[in-house]
């Protein structure tokens, strides 16, 4: 349970996280399991420990083996094991199964491919993306943050996608590549009467006077592309733009998201410097499409600033 497989290619950077988490964690010590020899923390070493992370900069085939991490705190010491395998670089284009990360599925309208393990590294955009070893070019492909977006996905887009990025450590650059398979699902679209997921009908939202508050109006309208769909906020039955209170604004740009394959929209109402009079207003979340309109009403109530029993860091 507390062991994790990690792999990488020789001469590339590999960063591994300890599979045990501290609750809390004060220090983390790393050891070579076979020899019980401590792994240094000095960054001048090619292999060194940095808290929860074990860094191979760069990795060598001889680094393969099991590494022990001990998460120390006053109450308990927790032990985890990282099973690391470093492979030689392939001369041909084929990426063997043992170098593949989990397969992801996409559809015509949802085609994000995340670059595996990238959150462990100190990298800067943009990522380079390859499909079956060919650099991706053309307007259909967009490298966005840590993922690739493919517009108008077709069944031919299925295949093995490799992301390549540079990890920077103290001014030195190291290359990292990671590959995963992408499969394409056929998706039939449909439209239905709007379903508001948030807020709940007649919800009371607790706010602090003088603080900022956000209300999210979130609704789903069916599956696939929606011809007409919108979510918006009204104040006392009036559009936000017509209400004329500059402290209260709708967040621009309704992004169509696909949770569980559904086409959904979000609209955030931002209230700056909440005032007493804001508690008297009626806030309506409206969702509409060709089937009709649904409305959920929210009211604000004052919250005592630190009257919490479950504050956590």
């Amino acid at each position: 349970k507390f062991s994790k497989q990690s792999w990488g290619l020789e001469n590339e950077a590999l960063i591994v996280r300890c599979p045990r988490q501290g609750k809390p964690s004060y220090t983390v010590d790393w050891y070579y399991s076979q020899t019980n020899k401590s792994i240094p923390t000095q960054e001048r070493n090619r292999v060194f420990a940095s808290g929860q992370l074990l860094k191979f900069l760069p990795a060598a085939v001889a680094d393969s083996g099991i590494y022990t991490c001990i998460v120390r705190s006053p109450t308990f010491n927790r032990t985890g094991y990282a099973n690391v395998t470093i492979y030689k670089k392939q001369s041909d284009c084929n990426v063997p199964d043992y170098l593949m990360y989990s397969t992801v599925s996409g559809s015509e309208k949802n085609s994000k491919i995340y670059c595996p393990t990238i959150d462990l590294y100190n990298w800067t955009a943009p990522l380079e993306w390859f499909k079956n070893c060919q650099a991706l070019q053309g307007s259909r492909y967009r490298a966005h943050k840590s993922f690739l977006v493919i517009d108008n996905v077709m069944t031919e887009d299925a295949g093995d996608y490799t992301c390549k990025f540079i990890h920077n450590e103290n001014g030195a650059n190291y290359s990292v590549t990671a590959t995963r398979s992408f499969t394409v699902k056929d998706e039939q679209g449909f439209s239905l009467f709007p379903v508001i997921g948030a807020p709940a009908q007649n919800e009371i939202k607790e706010v602090e006077i003088g603080k900022n508050a956000n209300l999210t109006c979130s609704a789903c309208f069916g599956k696939g592309t929606q011809f007409l769909a919108a979510v918006l906020w009204q104040l006392n039955g009036t559009k936000i733009t017509d209400f004329g209170e500059p402290r209260i604004q709708q967040e621009e740009g309704q992004n169509q998201s696909f949770s569980n394959g559904l086409a959904c929209l979000d609209m955030v109402l931002r209230i700056a410097d909440v005032k007493e009079e804001d508690l008297l207003l009626q806030y309506d979340c409206l969702a509409l499409n060709l089937h009709g309109l649904r409305r959920h009403t929210v009211r604000l109530s004052r919250k005592n600033p630190i009257d919490h029993h479950s504050i956590y860091c």
Epitope: K23, F76, C313
Partner: antibody, heavy 118, light 112 residues
Framework: QVQLQQSGAELVRPGASVTLSCKAS????????IHWVKQTLVHGLEWIGA????????AYNQKFKGKATLTADKSSSTAYMELSSLTSEGSAVYYC???????????WGQGTTLTVSS | DIVMTQAAFSNPVTLGTSASISCRSS???????????LYWYLQKPGQSPQLLIY???NLASGVPDRFSSSGSGTDFTLRISRVEAEDVGVYYC?????????FGSGTKLEIK
Amino acid sequence: QVQLQQSGAELVRPGASVTLSCKASDYIFTDSEIHWVKQTLVHGLEWIGAIDPETGDTAYNQKFKGKATLTADKSSSTAYMELSSLTSEGSAVYYCSGSTTDCYFAYWGQGTTLTVSS
Amino acid sequence: DIVMTQAAFSNPVTLGTSASISCRSSKSLLHSNGIIYLYWYLQKPGQSPQLLIYQMSNLASGVPDRFSSSGSGTDFTLRISRVEAEDVGVYYCAQNLELPFTFGSGTKLEIK
């Protein structure tokens, strides 16, 4: 909202034992340590011990070793503290408390009042 | 055991003014990792304690920024910049550096 729901007040006779419970909701029970704290007017807040629900490992304050026994049931997300051979010194409010990555006593139960009296 | 020392009462403060509460530890709470393991809690009348500050100077989630904390390895101060009526209660400092974890005896915030 993370909640730790503790069992109700107890009145027990000297020499008896009692088991207090602490049920966690809205967070992963095994992702936290559960700590127990005693509060009296005389001694204030005193740390009794902690349990790691994931492994069942325990740590105790030497003062309460042999007096308190901590256990946890992962299936019901509940931690228990058994207090044995009780005397009037055991009369107190007992709190369970959950930890996070940065804090040991990040959130607290509502407390259980224990009265030891004949 | 590390002893945490607090005064039983604060100087009475007027609402809207600032208040300071002190705490002293019998041993430095500075860990080799560079973190000072000093925590502040507030216990309002009839309620459980609630976390205010962790690792000496970090504000816990949901706590107003009127609260701040500073100190060395052994001497610590909790400051409330504009005291409000709901801030009344007993303020405890605690150390999480080593077992057994220990708490101060608490300082009651008094309003004039």
